[in-house]
């Protein structure tokens, strides 16, 4: 006889609440002559053999319940034209049962811990009753072909919920299950799948870029947020409000939205779903300057590509601090930011900061009632030599006959550091060049005592890394001054 449970040409197991016995086999070569099945009790009626006729061309048969006793062990074999067809099989009616499908309840609990997770409650099959079953569950995205099996298998004496982890937001999933008698055979059929939809995730981090607290009228602010799942295309709904007024922007692509003037709060939520977490309400109210952090300092961090930022608390403790930074010339949506608890008064900004590139760094204290930002600080990872010199132009003589010149600032991205000083140079035709350093706070020079003739003037600017190239020349023609300038 074949060991119980191993697959073979003849397989038998009991099915369903009536307890009928199903036997099936691989199709026979001779389809015209129907086989005959025999079964014999090995436990209760060892002398009785039952014969079961099989309809022609059929490779299965049902043995009626009245032919055997429920907890019996049966020996089953088959013949065709009086010749044995297979080795006889022993069937333990206590364990060789094919259970019904488990019931999966439609209430799906979804939580967002480290990942998006779904929990489903289930009930064991109605049949077989009072048996401990092992049940296996699987899930897949609705459009997918292949299923993912869930581990571990669950027992019906515990009814642990089914848990699915690492799900994608805004995605349709299906889950189904099947059961097997513990230490038995075979598996039941897979249940019809339960479908459920995961919600879209709220943006993880909402902030405001630009001059939300600008009082000079140049208020240009952008609400920005971090995409919780960059691979999933989601649109958002953004609400802004002030007093009784609320404005809504729908179908906003990730991850920015202009802030209308005078708005006091903003909320961002996934466009087409109700979130299970209340969305974050960012207050846009500008608080008094004394609530802002003070003494913000920025420096290059030793032995690391980051930038160190420190500050002191304002007059009261905030809920948190936000430090944001952007490269000079970047658009408002290119902002980076990090949140820090109120006890932190320093941070090392992460990322690769390029030498010679100015970064605008702002520390903001966040309160339940609004925001208070310290003045922004321009900082550098490393200063480089300037790429250009300032343009020079002539101002009205003061007094008449004494030339006055002025020069402009070199654009920040060409300056590549902080100006330590300017160098002002003048060259007369046929004579050597004379240069003079002046403070970085000075952008004009009076030229008394110049002798008659033509002159060329230019200015360079220096950072701590060194002196930059000369700016464009200015030509001067002096008909009347007699005393030479040194």
């Amino acid at each position: 006889t074949r060991p119980h449970g191993s697959p073979g040409p003849l397989q038998c197991y009991s099915v369903g609440p009536l307890g009928i016995l199903n036997c099936s086999w691989e199709p026979l070569g001779d389809l015209e002559t129907p086989p005959v099945l025999y079964h014999q009790s090995q436990k209760y009626h060892p002398n009785r053999v039952w014969e079961v006729k099989v309809p022609s061309k059929q490779s299965w048969v049902t043995i009626p319940r009245e032919q055997f006793t429920m907890a019996d062990k049966l020996l089953i074999w088959g013949t065709q034209k009086g010749r044995p067809l297979w080795s006889s099989v022993s069937v333990n009616l206590e364990t060789q049962m094919k259970p019904d499908t488990p019931q999966i309840f439609s209430q799906v609990d979804i939580s967002e811990e480290a990942t998006l997770e779904a929990t489903v409650q289930w009930a064991p099959p109605v049949w077989p009753p009072q048996k401990v079953l092992i049940c296996q569950f699987r899930y897949k995205e609705c459009q997918a072909e292949t299923w993912t099996r869930l581990e571990p298998q669950l027992k019906t004496d515990g009814l642990t919920p089914v848990e699915m982890q690492n799900l994608e937001p805004g995605t349709c999933y299906q889950v189904s299950g099947r059961c097997q008698v513990e230490n038995g055979y075979p598996w039941g059929e897979w249940s019809s799948p339960l479908s459920f939809q995961t919600p879209f995730l709220d943006p993880e981090d909402v902030w405001v870029s630009g001059t939300v607290c600008e009082t000079s009228g140049k208020r240009a602010a952008l609400l920005v947020w971090k995409d919780p799942r960059p691979c999933v295309q989601v649109t958002y709904t953004v609400w802004f409000g002030a007093g009784d007024i609320t404005t809504t922007q729908e179908e906003v692509p990730c991850c920015k939205s202009p802030v209308p003037a005078w708005m006091e709060w903003a909320v961002v939520s996934p466009g087409n779903s109700t979130s299970w977490v209340p969305p974050t309400n960012l207050s846009l109210v500008c608080l008094a300057p004394e609530s802002a952090p003070c003494d913000v300092g920025v420096s290059s961090a030793d032995g690391s590509p980051g930038i160190k930022v420190t500050w002191k608390q304002g007059t009261r403790k905030p809920l948190e601090y936000v430090v944001d930074w952007a490269q000079d010339g970047d658009s408002l949506d290119k902002l980076n930011w990090t949140r820090l608890p109120p006890g932190n008064l320093s941070t090392l900004l992460p990322g690769e900061f390029k030498g010679g590139v100015p970064y605008r760094i702002t520390v903001t204290a966040v309160y339940s009632g609004g925001l208070a930002a310290a003045p922004s600080v321009w900082g550098f990872r490393e200063e480089l030599v300037p790429l250009a010199g300032p343009a020079v132009w002539r101002l009205p003589d003061d007094p008449p006959g004494t030339p006055v010149v002025a020069w402009g600032e070199v654009p920040r991205h060409q300056l590549r550091g902080q100006a330590t000083h300017y160098t002002f140079c003048i060259q007369s035709r046929g004579l050597s060049t004379v240069c003079r350093n002046v403070s970085s706070q000075t952008q004009t020079a009076t030229l008394p005592n110049l002798h008659l003739g033509s002159f060329k003037l230019w200015v360079t600017v220096s950072t701590v890394a060194g002196q930059g190239p000369p700016g464009p020349n200015l030509s001067l023609h002096l008909p009347d001054n007699r005393i030479r300038w040194k």
Epitope: G297, I361, T420, S440
Partner: nanobody, 123 residues
């Protein structure tokens, strides 16, 4: 690489004066400062100056008595200390860094340090 060397420390009676000097060699610093540390106390900022720009900043405890200045010809930053008090007794350190914003006397931003020079003021 920036190298810093202090000089000018010593002993003086209360009410007297001393001039500390810090010689700097190397590039890429825009701010220099003087810090001090008395035995059993935390290091504290005394005065700082922006190189080239000439802006200065003083701790409240030394305002009106100490003056920080830059001598471009000698490439030094000096600290003139007048009306010295016994509580000014400490080891004085010169520090330098590439620092921006208003954290003038925050030692975390200064990444180059001298060995220190001792100042002792007796009553």
């Amino acid at each position: 690489q920036v190298q810093l060397q202090e000089s000018g420390g010593g002993s003086v009676q209360a009410g007297g004066s001393l001039r500390l000097s810090c010689a700097a060699s190397g590039y890429s610093i825009n701010r220099m400062g003087w810090f001090r540390q008395a035995p059993g106390k935390e290091r504290e900022g005394v005065a700082a100056i922006s190189i080239g720009g000439g802006r200065t900043y003083y701790a409240d405890s030394v305002k009106g008595r100490f003056t920080i200045s830059q001598d471009n010809a000698k490439n030094t930053v000096d600290l003139q200390m007048n009306s010295l008090k016994p509580e000014d007794t400490a080891m004085y350190y010169c520090a330098a860094g590439l620092v921006y914003g208003e954290a003038w006397l925050d030692s975390r931003h200064y990444n180059k340090w001298g060995q220190g020079t001792q100042v002792t003021v007796s009553s």
